[in-house]
Each structure stands twice: as C-alpha cells, then as structure tokens.
C-alpha cells in the first residue's frame, strides 16, 4: 500500500498581471467525499498559508471571498490560480491535500511549485 502522492509542476512563471496557475493532482488511497486543499508558501524555513479550500467530491472548489486564490476541481485534480502576485512573492508554493471525510484522514504534500514573478516595467510617459 503506497502513501498518497501529490503531483504539481516544478516551475511556473506568473503572467505580467501577477497571475499564476498550476495543477495539483493527487492519487487517493481512500474514497474521500470531503477534501481540503491548501496552498502554502515556503521561504527559507518558514511556511505560511496562502489560501485553503474544502470541497465535496463532485462539487466546486470554493475559497473565501477575500482569498487571493481561485480554483476548479475535477476528480482528483485541482486547478489552482493565485492572483495579485508581485516580484517579492517569488517562491516555492506547496500544494497540501487532506482527505478529511470519511475517516481515516490522509495527508499528502507536493514537492512544491517554484513561482517566478516579474514586476512589469512601468510604461514610459508619452507626449501627444
């Protein structure tokens, strides 16, 4: 019996508008009906929560209204989008998957996605 595996891309480049998207996929060892997905940012040895959402299998993924994340789910795959990123937010973003219900609980953690954010160059002033 192998432990739950979580896969995510190694590297993602954010768009010029500070939006980064990546897929988090997990191989479930059980028949979960309730799943929690958390995005964590690891900088040095500090780990902080970026956003989290719990969803019922077959239903949509819903983050809190003030969250910088949005996402959609399809089976054991979650499409995550993080918005409002700036160059200082460049770092390793880890996808954590928890099978919450029914028991037993299972934990799975991806290796992390290195998100690179480049602040856009300010537009030069133009005279008309």
């Amino acid at each position: 019996c192998k432990a739950m595996h979580v896969a995510q891309p190694a590297v993602v480049l954010a768009s010029s508008r500070g939006i980064a998207s990546f897929v988090c996929e997990y191989a479930s060892p059980g028949k979960a009906t309730e799943v929690r997905v958390t995005v964590l940012r690891q900088a040095d040895s500090q780990v902080t929560e970026v956003c989290a959402a719990t969803y019922m299998m077959g239903n949509e993924l819903t983050f809190l209204d003030d969250s910088i994340c949005t996402g959609t789910s399809s089976g054991n795959q979650v499409n995550l989008t993080i918005q409002g990123l700036r160059a200082m937010d460049t770092g390793l973003y880890i996808c954590k998957v928890e099978l919450m219900y029914p028991p037993p609980y299972y934990l799975g953690i991806g290796n992390g996605t290195q998100i690179y954010v480049i602040d856009p160059e300010p537009c030069p002033d133009s005279d008309f």
């Epitope: 019996c1 192998k2 432990a3 739950m4 309730e34 929690r36 964590l40 690891q42 780990v47 929560e49 989290a52 880890i94 954590k96 928890e98 919450m100 219900y101 028991p103 037993p104 609980y105 299972y106 934990l107 953690i109």
Partner: antibody
Framework: QVQLVESGGGVVQPGRSLRLSCAAS????????MHWVRQAPGKGLEWVAV????????HYADSVKGRFTISRDNSKNTLYLQMNSLRAEDTAVYYC????????????WGQGTLVAVSS | DIQMTQSPSSLSASVGDRVTITCRAS??????LNWYQQKPGKAPKLLIY???SLQSGVPSRFSGSGSGTDFTLTISSLQPEDFATYYC?????????FGPGTKVDIK
C-alpha cells in the same frame, strides 16, 4: 510565542465525566489541527483525538470513540476534550498539541494535566 | 490502522557512543515520520520531523533518515542530557500512532 496551557484535570470516579481545556496563544488558532495525546503512568504516548481547522471534522482513537468528544472555540482560541463514562484505563496525563501546518508533527505541547479515574 | 514498532525497546550506552534507534511502519507513510524525546515528568520534545528534518534548536548530533516503512534515529555522540525515552510517530493517517518507545539509559 506559541503557548498551550491545559486545565481541568483531577480525580474522578469511574463512569463520571470531566472536561479538559487547552488555552492557545501566539498563533492563528483556526489554521491548525489540534490534538489530544495521553500517557498512562509508566506507559508510552497514545494519540487520542484531533479536530481540524473550523471544527467540522474530528477523528478519534478507537479506545475513546463514543465516550470522548473533542471540540474547539476559535473565537476563544481554546481546545476542549469532554470525557464521559470514564474508566480506570483512562487514567493518564493528557497533553494538547498543535499539529504543524505542513506535515502535522507536534512542534508545540502543553504541560499536561493529570486525570485520575479511581473509586 | 498503521502500526508503529520500535527497536530496541531499551538500550544501555555510554557518553560518546553512537546510538541508533529504528522505527518501522506497518504500511508506507512516505516521509511523514517524527521523532520525540521525553524525560520523566516532562512533555515530549520534537527532535526530527518529516523523517530527516532537524527541529530548530535541536543539536546536530541528532539525525533521522528513511522513507516508506523503515526509519532511523541516530545520535552521533551520546551526551549526558540525551538519556531519555525516544518515540517515533506517524502523521500520515488517523489514528496518528506512536511507537512504543526506546529507553536510553546509562551503561
């Protein structure tokens, strides 16, 4: 700094009830799974129960299922363990512990509170 | 449920000795394995998390290795303050089981 302080232990007769509390401070309480772990005199560590985040999901050891209830009040940063139908084998030091945000290890423990079930 | 076993259950060693404790899970737990040290009358203290990561403030003589089902805690040079009981624990799936412990005492 992170602090966990248990209270509510004491001597109780078999079949009676007791409620333990764990006051947490120094971190965003609602972002963490919170656990109870116990240790009978001269014995090893035994995981008792966990309650996740918003309190909707809870899991228990078979030895306490149906008798113990774990709960939390995120507005008060407090964890609880309601222990009913207590037995002599529930005699132990009870610790609350914070599960790490990433891999769930117990980086922070309370000092423990002793529950003695005796007639 | 995942069962955790530890060996040896106790050992006697001298200051300066290299000590190795093994922990085995009844099924794969990836790297979700933690090691704790406990002294009489005290709460357990985290030493190693995620199989091989040293907890902040823990001396570098402690190290952990392994993944899947087999794990090891090594103390490279035993110090007087290291005489204690050591527990492994899995944080992969409920119930979050502990090993039975290994008591390290003075030879």
């Amino acid at each position: 700094q992170v602090q966990l302080v248990e209270s509510g232990g004491g001597v109780v007769q078999p079949g009676r009830s007791l409620r333990l509390s764990c006051a947490a401070s120094g971190f965003t309480f609602s972002s963490y799974g919170m656990h109870w772990v116990r240790q009978a005199p001269g014995k090893g560590l035994e995981w008792v129960a966990v309650i996740w985040y918003d309190g909707n999901n809870k899991h228990y050891a078979d030895s306490v299922k149906g008798r113990f209830t774990i709960s939390r009040d995120n507005s008060k940063n407090t964890l609880y363990l309601q222990m009913n139908s207590l037995r002599a084998e529930d005699t132990a030091v009870y610790y609350c512990a914070r599960g790490d945000i990433l891999t769930g290890y117990y980086g922070y423990w309370g000092q423990g509170t002793l529950v003695a079930v005796s007639s | 449920d995942i069962q955790m076993t530890q060996s040896p259950s106790s050992l006697s060693a001298s200051v300066g000795d290299r000590v190795t404790i093994t922990c085995r899970a009844s099924q794969s737990i990836s790297s979700y394995l933690n090691w704790y040290q406990q002294k009489p009358g005290k709460a357990p203290k985290l030493l190693i998390y995620a199989a091989s990561s040293l907890q902040s403030g823990v001396p570098s003589r402690f190290s952990g290795s392994g993944s899947g089902t087999d794990f090891t805690l090594t103390i490279s040079s035993l110090q007087p303050e290291d005489f204690a009981t050591y527990y492994c624990q899995q944080s992969y799936s409920t119930p979050f089981t502990f090993g039975p412990g290994t008591k390290v005492d003075i030879k």
